[in-house]
Amino acid sequence: GTIETTGNISAKKGGSVILQCHLSSTMAQVTQVNWEQHDHSLLAIRNAELGWHIYPAFKDRVAPGPGLGLTLQSLTMNDTGEYFCTYHTYPDGTYRGRIFLEVLESSVAEHSARFQIP
């Protein structure tokens, strides 16, 4: 299987950004997806049956979705850094993807470069 992510993305301070990963090239069942920040603190978990658990430190700034992704709102400069999606699957095991978010002071247009992590 392969994790495809939104790669390196930038967004404006005060704006919002969608963190998105997609698992392909496998028939494995996704049982859970974890979203972690650069310091490895959990932002959210999405269990296949029970839905989302949003961690309280982020509950006012994180919106679940679209899909298995996460929308991070009211961005601050401190949000700059790495984000990780971890897919727990059966029977394959664990897949991990990385996204780098840069929060910009200026009104630089948002862009994203898609790339794959084996």
Partner: antibody, heavy 119, light 107 residues
Framework: EVQLQQSGPELVKPGASVKISCKTS????????MHWVKQSHGKSLEWIGG????????SYNQKFKGRATLAVDKSSNTAYMELRSLTSEDSAVYYC????????????WGQGTTLTVSS | DIVLTQSHKFMSTSVGDRVSITCKAS??????VAWYQQKSGQSPKLLIY???YRNTGVPDRFTGSGSGTDFTFTIDSVQAEDLAVYFC?????????FGTGTKLELK
């Protein structure tokens, strides 16, 4: 005020089935997961499973899968747990517990239903 | 399944004492731990969620800390009404599991 009202105590014979109900009030039933938890006498707590009423998603503890069935009736805001092929090991107090909003921990609990399995 | 170990089944304390209850997970659960209080003949009550957040209406003498595999629940100044069994629970992955419980009793 959030309330979870469970059905009364049950005395059943080995091999039989039981269905415990959990009638809720004071919140939007479909927006919160309902968990079921077993507590054997003087022992710890055991998660049986959880059900998300909005989409019917159910997660079972493998230990109970096949013998426990979780269900909801959205029209009456009631959750149910059926347990089949009962043995004396199933004698315990069973709780329904509401998952907190966008969380997996349980912020409101029913009063518990005592199940006794005996011939 | 993730196993949660509460090393003390019983803890003796006096009113006004500070007491800490520990919970060790068999694998990394980040901060996905809750603490419940259960008084005799009653249902469990949520005190702490996500390792360190107090539930609504819970007195500030109750605190939680930890991440990864080691978690601590502390009562700063024990009151008589705090005598109960305390359970930790992990909600990092299903099946969600509970610790064996620690009963707080008076010396």
């Amino acid at each position: 005020e959030v309330q979870l009202q469970q059905s009364g105590p049950e005395l059943v014979k080995p091999g039989a089935s039981v269905k415990i109900s959990c009638k809720t009030s004071g919140y939007t039933f479909t927006e919160f997961t309902m968990h079921w938890v077993k507590q054997s006498h003087g022992k710890s707590l055991e998660w049986i499973g959880g059900l998300k009423p909005d989409n019917g998603g159910i997660s079972y503890n493998q230990k109970f899968k096949g013998r426990a069935t979780l269900a909801v009736d959205k029209s009456s805001n009631t959750a149910y747990m059926e347990l089949r092929s009962l043995t004396s090991e199933d004698s315990a107090v069973y709780y329904c517990a509401r998952g907190a909003y966008y969380r997996y921990d349980a912020d409101y609990w029913g009063q518990g239903t005592t199940l006794t399995v005996s011939s | 399944d993730i196993v949660l170990t509460q090393s003390h089944k019983f803890m003796s304390t006096s009113v006004g004492d500070r007491v800490s209850i520990t919970c060790k997970a068999s694998q990394d659960v980040k901060t996905a731990v809750a603490w419940y209080q259960q008084k005799s003949g009653q249902s469990p009550k949520l005190l702490i969620y996500s390792a360190s957040y107090r539930n609504t209406g819970v007195p500030d003498r109750f605190t939680g800390s930890g991440s990864g595999t080691d978690f601590t629940f502390t009562i700063d100044s024990v009151q008589a009404e705090d005598l109960a069994v305390y359970f930790c629970q992990q909600h990092y992955s299903t099946p969600f599991t509970f610790g064996t419980g620690t009963k707080l009793e008076l010396k």
